[in-house]
Every structure is written in structure tokens, then in C-alpha cells.
Interface confidence: low
């Protein structure tokens, strides 16, 4: 007699380890013999899928090698055309020993920064992650924490954090260890003992002392007035990550001697500098507020504007003065492409002479600022329209960068050529050609042949600007 299908052994939850075999049994009584189909998460399992074996007229479903993605609800459905189809469902829970999917890697980090050693794991039940430093379990503290992901985060890395680390992933099925990795803590170069300034008699010997530390141990170089030391002897010793350098000099002229300690962090360098002056008794007194050196201009942007082989002031508040000042000019120069033909050469002359100021190479190299009258000539005569537009943009916050402000002088703060003609630099490009007041003669020397006629003084200025904006 025909009999509707009945499932005599309902499906149950099956636990299986990754790469092991898992079997679901769906025993059915019926007549005629039923057709049995299987689904996973409501998607039909195809009979020809080689990852599965379906036997006993469809009553046995075997997963031949369980993967972690096989998790889900499996159902068998039996139908023989008599009565309705019947269904039974059960879950497959894939159990997995811990596995480290993203192991930690060697890390070099600069002291004070944040270090993260990755350790991403897989496993069911979810593994717990701990860390070992050296031979001991790592204890979490205010700076050290194991994140939800298993990664180790160390805030404000200190020298003592350096060492060998490994992560450990553990669940009820087993334990996995990562390979040992190294955390190296690097420390910026720092000068421990700066060279001292000396005032000596002509022809004496002086020893300048400079001590520095860092990880890796820095190298020390000595600079004399902006150039590599050409004479004198240097003795160095290294002990306990401290380098000690002594420069012995025979003094025949005053100079500014800079000790530069440099160490390398990946592709970047860290540099610490300390300077000392060696003056000769009865030579002129050094000025103390200028930090820089005189050097021939060797850039490109201002080649046509500055005098050939001009001696310019390079500001050592930049790590790389020559490049920093050149890039500063370059950035501002690009903005000058759009200004009027009258303004452009004047603005270029002002820009180059402001960023690369003429340098007086005394005991302490001194920059010579542009004369106020020339600055005002650019501002109020040649580039009045553009200057106003720039101030307006600054006022309305349209400039995203402060960089252009560095390349625009404050005219009112510059010395007047009427106070002391030698205390400020003139801009030859701005000196009028009497036949044609709008031309800029080619530069033949750094001194103008004609004084600028009727230059507006700051008092007769056609407009003024609040000092809040450093454009005046």
C-alpha cells in the first residue's frame, strides 16, 4: 500500500573539526521509495558537488573535508508523491583549533610613538590571545593592551619595551604560537653636551666637545660657517650608545661651529644640532639672534633674479635649509603665473630676495632684509591690485596653506634705506629705466644705478591693512 514519507531519525546538531568528515543521517520510511534532497542554508546541494557524498538512496549526507565556511543549517526533504513532503533540519558547527591568520612582524618604532603588533586569529570556539615577551607572559598595563582583534598595542613606546614578542592563541581544542618577532625602539639623535663658545687670542688652539646619544648611535659631523670643517682634527669615541666627538682647532679667524648629530630611522634621518662661536678677542661682537649660514645660491628658481654667485642666508631652523627655501620659493612662484606682466617681475624679485636674503658673512652670518621702500613699491605700485586680492583671500580664509605667508614680507617691519643704506638690500629689478618706467632692466650688479623716484612712503599709502594679517 502507498505510504507517505516519515523521517524516523530527525537531523541533529553535528560538531566537526576542520578537515574532518561530518555526516548527517535522514532515515525515511515510505512507499514508494522517496526522492530525498538536501539543502544548506536553504540552498540546494547539487548531487554532483564533489565536496559531498550522498548515499543510501539519499539518506546519508557526508561532507568529506569540513571547511570553516561549511557552518550552517542542513535540511533533508523527502517526497514520494503520497501526502506532502517532509523535512528535518540540523546544524553543523565547525570546530577549529586556533590558527594565527595574521602573525606579528618585526617592528622598528621611534620612542614615544604607538606600536601595534598584529595577531589576528581564527578558531571555534573563538581563541583567547595572550602575548609573551622574552620568556614571560606579558602583563597589560596603562600603556600596553591586547586589543579585541588580538593585536598588541603599546602607547608611548619606551626603550624598555624593546625585545622579543610572540602571541599565543588558545581554545579548548588546542594552542597556536606565532613566530618570535623583534620590537626595536629607535631614539632620535639628541645632544647631551653642546660645544661651548670661546673667545680666544689669534693663533690659539681650542677643543670643542660634543656628546650625543640615540638609537642607533648617531654620527657626529662638524660644520664651520655652513661648510664642512676644512681644518682641525676630530677624535671620536662611542660607549653605551653615547658618542663623544672632540674637534681641535687652530684659530686664525672667528667662526660658527655646529655639531650635527644624525641617526637614521628607516629612510628618514633625525638630526640634532648645537652651535658654538669661536671669536677672537677684539674682533666685532657676534649677534646672537640669527640662526643660519651664508652660502652661494645654488638653486634654480631664483637664478635669473639673484645676482650671479649671490651669497644668501640659509636658515638652519629648517632641517635642510637649501631645499626647504627653494621649495618655498617654488610653491609661491607658481602662484605668480597668473599675475599681471607689470607685477610679476617685481613680485618675483621681492619673493626671491625675501626668501633668499642677501647674507653678510661676519662672525655670525646675518641676513640683510629688503629695504622697506622696495617692498612698498611692489605692494603699492607694481602689484597693488594683486596684493589687495591676496589680502582679501586671506581675510576670507581662502588660502588653505600658510606657506605663501612665509614668502611675503611685512613691509612696515623692514628697515628704510634712508636710515642706513647698508642695513637693507635693494631690488635692482625695480629700479626705473627712465625711458620706459615699466621695464625691468637686466641685472648687472646688486646695486641700483638710479634711486626709485617718488616711491610711496608708508604714510602716503593708498590703503592700509590690519596688522592681524601679515601682509603689510
Amino acid at each position: 500500500l502507498p505510504k507517505a514519507p516519515v523521517i524516523t531519525t530527525p537531523l541533529e546538531t553535528v560538531d566537526a573539526l576542520v578537515e574532518e568528515v561530518a555526516t548527517f543521517m535522514c532515515a525515511v520510511e515510505s512507499y514508494p521509495q522517496p526522492e530525498i534532497s538536501w539543502t544548506r542554508n536553504k540552498i540546494l546541494i547539487k548531487l554532483f558537488d564533489t565536496r559531498y557524498s550522498i548515499r543510501e538512496n539519499g539518506q546519508l549526507l557526508t561532507i568529506l573535508s569540513v571547511e570553516d565556511s561549511d557552518d550552517g543549517i542542513y535540511c533533508c526533504t523527502a517526497n514520494n508523491g503520497v501526502g506532502g513532503a517532509v523535512e528535518s533540519c540540523g546544524a553543523l558547527q565547525v570546530k577549529m583549533k586556533p590558527k594565527i591568520t595574521r602573525p606579528p612582524i618585526n617592528v622598528k618604532i621611534i620612542e614615544g610613538l604607538k606600536a601595534v603588533l598584529p595577531c589576528t586569529t581564527m578558531g571555534n570556539p573563538k581563541p583567547s590571545v595572550s602575548w609573551i615577551k622574552g620568556d614571560s607572559p606579558l602583563r597589560e598595563n596603562s600603556r600596553t593592551a591586547v586589543l579585541e582583534s588580538g593585536s598588541l598595542r603599546i602607547h608611548n613606546v619606551q626603550k624598555e619595551d624593546a625585545g622579543q614578542y610572540r602571541c599565543v592563541a588558545k581554545n579548548s581544542l588546542g594552542t597556536a604560537y606565532s613566530k618570535v618577532v623583534k620590537l626595536e625602539v629607535e631614539v632620535f639623535a639628541r645632544i647631551l653636551r653642546a660645544p661651548e663658545s670661546h673667545n680666544v687670542t689669534f693663533g690659539s688652539f681650542v677643543t670643542l666637545h660634543c656628546t650625543a646619544t640615540g638609537i642607533p648611535v648617531p654620527t657626529i659631523t662638524w660644520i664651520e660657517n655652513g661648510n664642512a670643517v676644512s681644518s682641525g682634527s676630530i677624535q671620536e669615541s662611542v660607549k653605551d650608545r653615547v658618542i663623544d666627538s672632540r674637534l681641535q682647532l687652530f684659530i686664525t679667524k672667528p667662526g660658527l661651529y655646529t655639531c650635527i648629530a644624525t641617526n637614521k630611522h628607516g629612510e628618514k634621518f633625525s638630526t640634532a644640532k648645537a652651535a658654538a662661536t669661536v671669536s677672537i678677542a677684539e674682533w666685532s661682537k657676534p649677534q646672537k639672534d640669527n640662526k643660519g649660514y651664508c652660502a652661494q645660491y645654488r638653486g634654480e628658481v631664483c637664478n635669473a633674479v639673484l645676482a650671479k654667485d649671490a651669497l644668501v642666508f640659509l636658515n638652519t631652523s629648517y632641517a635642510d635649509p637649501e631645499e626647504a627655501q627653494e621649495l618655498l620659493v617654488h610653491t609661491a612662484w607658481n602662484e605668480l603665473k597668473v599675475v599681471s606682466p607689470l607685477c610679476r617681475p617685481a613680485a618675483e624679485a621681492l619673493l626671491c630676495n625675501h626668501v633668499f636674503q642677501e647674507c653678510s658673512p661676519g662672525v655670525v652670518p646675518t641676513p640683510i632684509p629688503i629695504c622697506r621702500e622696495y617692498c612698498l613699491a611692489v605692494k603699492e605700485l607694481f602689484c597693488a591690485k594683486e596684493w589687495l586680492a591676496m589680502e582679501e583671500k586671506t581675510h576670507r580664509g581662502l588660502y588653505r596653506s600658510e606657506m605663501h605667508l612665509l614668502s611675503v614680507p611685512e613691509c612696515s617691519k623692514l628697515p628704510s634705506m634712508h636710515w642706513d643704506p647698508t642695513a637693507c638690500a635693494r631690488l635692482p629689478h625695480l629700479d626705473y629705466n627712465k625711458e620706459n618706467p615699466k621695464t625691468f632692466p637686466p641685472m648687472t650688479s646688486s646695486k641700483p644705478s638710479v634711486d626709485i623716484p617718488n616711491l610711496p612712503s608708508s604714510s602716503s599709502s593708498s590703503f592700509s591693512v590690519s596688522p592681524t594679517y601679515s601682509m603689510t
Partner: antibody
């Protein structure tokens, strides 16, 4: 006489590494920026990387960023190019070139004879 | 990203004048791109001819000159010689970031 002599080229498999060196003589090495320029067989020149006089900053062509590292040892008067994760398209003659000033982007005013790098399996 | 464009090939008669140009796929070449020109003969390393638009490198004959004309950089050879037959490359400074310095594809110059 100013001379730039490259070395370190050769045959390497894809994914491999090479370190090129450029020994400089006849000029004050630490006064000038330096560059690497390459030329694939039968193709044009291609700027690869640059470094200023003091190694304080580095510049790279986009396609080599993260794989190539330029460095210099001023005491040894040597420029280096460490090339990792090499690809077949990195096959080229690599020229070391001197810049006209300290900055990294000055004109190239002196060239070495080049060293051939072949990346092939 | 801007591409530096050059004529693939040009020819000139001995003693004649020829101008090679160097442009940008997007925009104009200006003095702020500091155009440089290099010459390369087969099997040889490149040689610097002109740097920063119009400065002749030492030892370069005066028949080579550089300029910016319209929206392109130009290399002019006045009174071409047979030994001027070579590949000529221009290179432009493109500002900060990546690909700071970009070469053109080169111009093959034939002196017929």
C-alpha cells in the same frame, strides 16, 4: 675627472631583490643631489628616484614607491638603490645621475654608463 | 596624471635648423617646470644639453638652444651636424609628491 660607476645589476627572478650602487669620484659628492634614471630595452628614459645632498628627503616614481629605496653614504661617496619585489617591467638599464645642485630636483648634469637589471623567470 | 609629449621623429638636412618641442598633455609648460634637454646616441649614456629652459651645459655647442614658445618648451638646433643624429629627451619638474621629474617619450632626430 668626474665619474659615476654603477654596479649591482644582473638577472633576478620576479619578486626578488637587487641593490644597485653608484660610486662617485672627481667631485664633492656630498654637495650634490643624485638620481636614478632607467631605460627599458628599446624604450625612453624614465626617472625613478632622487635624493638631495644630505639624504634628508627622498622622491620616487609612483610605480616604484614602497618597493625601491634610494639612499646615500656621503662618507663612501656612494649612491644606492635597493630594489625589492622586482617585476618584469623593472627590466632596464639603470643610470646613476648627478644633479646640478644640492636639491633633489636640479637638472641632471652628469651620467654613469648604466647597469643592466633583468627581471625574468 | 600629466604626460610629457614629444614628436616621435623629426629629420633635418645638414646645416639646416630644426625645433623639437616638449608639451604637457594637460596644461602648458612654464619656466616653473624647469625644462631640461638630454641627448642620447645608440649604446651610450644620455648627455645633458640644456637645463632650466635655456642654460647650455658646459661643452655643449652654441648651435643648441632652449626656450619656451607658446605653451611648450623647445630645443632648437641651428646648423645641424651629422653627429647630432640621436634621440632627444626633454624632462619637466612636476612639483612635490610622486613623479617629481618626468621624461618625455623622446624624439628620434635624423640628419639626412
Amino acid at each position: 675627472e668626474l665619474q659615476l660607476v654603477e654596479s649591482g645589476g644582473g638577472l633576478v627572478q620576479p619578486g626578488g631583490s637587487l641593490r644597485l650602487s653608484c660610486a662617485a669620484s672627481g667631485f664633492t659628492f656630498d654637495d650634490y643631489g643624485m638620481s636614478w634614471v632607467r631605460q627599458a630595452p628599446g624604450k625612453g628614459l624614465e626617472w625613478v628616484s632622487a635624493i638631495p645632498w644630505n639624504g634628508g628627503s627622498t622622491y620616487y616614481k609612483e610605480s616604484v614607491k614602497g618597493r625601491f629605496t634610494i639612499s646615500r653614504d656621503n662618507a663612501k661617496k656612494t649612491l644606492y638603490l635597493q630594489m625589492n619585489s622586482l617585476k618584469s617591467e623593472d627590466t632596464a638599464v639603470y643610470y646613476c645621475a648627478k644633479r646640478s645642485g644640492r636639491i633633489a630636483f636640479g637638472a641632471l648634469d652628469a651620467w654613469g654608463q648604466g647597469t643592466l637589471v633583468t627581471v625574468s623567470s | 596624471q600629466a604626460v610629457v609629449t614629444q614628436e616621435p621623429s623629426l629629420s633635418v638636412s645638414p646645416g639646416g635648423t630644426v625645433t623639437l618641442t616638449c608639451g604637457l598633455s594637460s596644461g602648458s609648460v612654464t619656466s616653473s617646470n624647469y625644462p631640461d634637454w638630454y641627448q642620447q646616441t645608440p649604446g651610450q649614456a644620455p648627455r645633458t644639453l640644456i637645463y632650466t629652459t635655456n642654460s647650455r651645459h658646459s661643452g655643449v655647442p652654441s648651435r643648441f638652444s632652449g626656450s619656451i614658445s607658446g605653451n611648450k618648451a623647445a630645443l632648437t638646433i641651428t646648423g645641424a651636424q651629422p653627429e647630432d643624429e640621436a634621440d632627444y629627451y626633454c624632462a619637466l619638474y612636476m612639483g612635490g609628491g610622486s613623479n617629481v621629474y618626468v621624461f618625455g617619450g623622446g624624439t628620434k632626430l635624423t640628419v639626412l
